[in-house]
């Protein structure tokens, strides 16, 4: 057993160019935690699969407002160290994820929102009991530094936390055949206590008469390399000489205890021996309580009172994810008109517009009129990000500058002869109709159908149209 | 406020077909855009069909040809009508609206959800 300790000396932005924007302003006020999440061995993993070695969350860093104008500087950290136990040995390889949370601490309906500002990973080998070893990872603009070490818990000792340690009985040495404990002079090595011939450098135990195997090693007594070839023989027991697994059938088989439990066979099944932080009859239970605030985004923490019973977080619209760590992609709605490119910042969507559109939705387009004339009386009409002009009678061309002819288009019905006019157009109707486009015939009687003609005029007379 | 009101979930046989409502109420001025989104139990949320601002229709590639979005624009109702429905459907169903409230500002709403489950 043992303890994993992360230390942060700073996050800020890293060399070069492109600093990244502060993450907080003086209308939103914010303030940085961190979450470390450790796995064994040396596998790529999905950052969503467990933590199976654990996970820890850091308290709040001091208050932080932008400073307008300022660079954003090494922002103020949370004071202590991230500390991550492990209750079984430590297995000299790992891989970390570290993730940096901004806290928004403005007027958010509800409470204060979170947010990832940065995520880094790594595969590293570590020694338990070895100095602290320093880091720098960067995530886009924004760099970290920071230390680690692996500590082990008494009365273990070693580079894997699996030789156990007594006080000394007698004041001056150690029993027989039991060397002192380094760097603890004062202590003795614990009699041995595992299953005789259990391999001193890749076996362990807790348990009097036990061998439990590190990772990469098998066998009763943990003297088998794990091979990565195929095996060609058929199922049966394990060959020490070729040191290829091939496991027999029975319930342990492929371990079915998760986040990094051991199996052990039963009479009847098996049983999961859970590490630390886990609980559950295959280890699948996290043991963090609702008083941990696992939730992210104003996730409602629901059970989980102690370690032994499990928390849900209920997450707020819009998030998901077991810890409501995941933003649901709001832009797949594609809410920004005018090809807009839509951008989910968490508090807000926000859309890029392109030239010649505005608005929060990208909805209008610019003024393309501004500064520019139509001539003759136009009026000028924006859309589609040009502009054009609607001309007055006898007027066309993009700006409304060459003269027209109204005749152009034929406009008198039935026949009736066009006369461009100096403001506008006269229709002279032929008989029978009538209207200022001869657009209504005359009944027989001399009723017109529709409408009446105005008063002193007759039908046939040109009528102006305008 | 905004509320987004979901209701036609259920149960239903692999092939069969079921439609979803969802109504919206409240300080509106105009709905921007509107949908739906599912998620399948244990699963990301995703985008399944719906109105973009540009009122352009858009359809996830594993339900086109089975489901048809619609609108009624006097109600602010949008319709998610399923056939052909598989096990795989099987998800709460989200309407989601980007809308213009009555100050002018956007906001995005989440409804509760309804829940389809399609099992022989």
């Known amino acids: 057993a043992g303890v994993f300790e992360l230390q942060i000396h700073s996050f800020g932005p890293g060399p070069g160019p492109g600093a990244p924007r502060s993450p907080c302003s003086a209308r939103l006020p914010c303030r940085l935690f961190f979450r470390v999440c450790l796995k064994p061995g040396l596998s790529e993993e999905a950052a969503e699969s467990p933590c199976a070695l654990g996970a820890a969350l850091s308290a709040r860093g001091p208050v932080y407002t932008e400073q307008p104008g300022a660079p954003a500087p090494d922002l103020p950290l949370p004071d202590g160290l991230l500390q991550v136990p492990f209750r079984d040995a430590w297995p000299g390889t790992f891989s970390f994820i570290i993730e940096t949370w901004r806290e928004e601490l403005g007027d958010q309906i509800g409470g204060p929102a979170w947010s990832l500002l940065a995520r880094v990973a790594g595969r590293r080998r570590l020694a338990a009991g070895g100095p602290w070893a320093r880091d720098i990872q960067r995530a886009g603009a924004w760099e970290l530094r920071f230390s680690y070490r692996a500590r082990c818990e008494p009365p273990a000792v070693g580079t894997a936390c699996t030789r156990l340690c007594r006080p000394r009985s007698a004041p001056s040495r150690c029993g027989p055949g039991l060397r002192p404990c380094a760097p603890l002079e004062d202590e003795c090595e614990a009699p041995l206590v595992c299953r005789a011939g259990c391999s001193p450098e890749h076996g362990f135990c807790e348990q009097p008469g036990e061998c439990r195997c590190l990772e990469g090693w098998t066998g009763p007594l943990c003297t088998v390399p794990v091979s990565t070839s195929s095996c060609l023989s058929p199922r049966g027991p394990s060959s020490a000489t070729t040191g290829c697994l091939v496991p027999g059938p029975g319930p342990c088989d492929g371990n079915p205890c998760a986040n990094g439990g051991s199996c052990s066979e039963t009479p009847r099944s098996f049983e999961c021996t859970c590490p630390r932080g886990f609980y559950g009859l295959r280890c699948e239970v996290s043991g963090v309580t609702c008083a941990d605030g696992p939730c992210f985004n104003g996730g409602l923490c629901v059970g989980g009172a102690d370690p032994d019973s499990a928390y849900i977080c209920h997450c707020p619209p819009g998030f998901q994810g077991s810890n409501c760590e995941k933003r649901v992609d709001r832009c797949s709605l594609q809410p920004c008109r005018n090809g807009g490119l839509c951008l989910d910042l968490g508090h807000a969507l926000r859309c890029r517009c392109r030239a010649g559109f505005a608005g929060p939705r990208c909805e209008h387009d610019l003024d393309d009129c501004a500064g520019r004339a139509c001539a003759n009386g136009g009026t000028c009409v924006e859309g589609g990000g040009a502009h054009r002009c609607s001309c007055a009678l006898g007027f066309g061309g993009r700006d409304c500058r060459e003269r027209a002819d109204p005749c152009a288009a034929r406009p008198c019905a039935h026949g009736g002869r066009c006369y461009a006019h100096f403001s506008g157009l006269v229709c002279a109707c032929a008989p029978g109709y009538m209207g200022a486009r001869c657009e209504f015939p005359v009944h027989p009687d001399g009723a017109s159908a529709l409408p009446a003609a105005p008063p002193g005029l007759r039908p046939g007379d040109p009528q102006r149209y305008l | 406020e905004v509320q987004l009101v979901e209701s036609g979930g259920g149960e239903v046989q692999p092939g069969g077909s079921l439609r979803l409502s969802c109504a919206a109420s409240?300080?509106?001025?105009?709905?921007?855009?509107m949908g739906w989104y599912r998620q399948p139990p244990g699963k990301q949320r995703e985008l399944v069909a719906g109105f973009t601002g540009d009122t352009n229709t858009i359809y996830a590639e594993s339900v086109k040809g089975r489901f048809t979005i619609s609108r009624d624009n006097a109600k602010n109702t949008v319709y998610l009508q399923m056939s052909s429905l598989r096990a795989e459907d099987t998800a709460v169903y989200y309407c989601?609206?980007?809308?213009?409230?009555?100050?002018?500002?956007?906001?995005?709403?989440w409804g509760q959800g309804t829940l389809v489950t399609v099992k022989p």
């Open positions: 409240g300080s509106i001025l105009s709905i921007n855009a």
């Open positions: 989601a609206a980007d809308v213009q409230l009555f100050s002018r500002d956007y906001e995005f709403y």
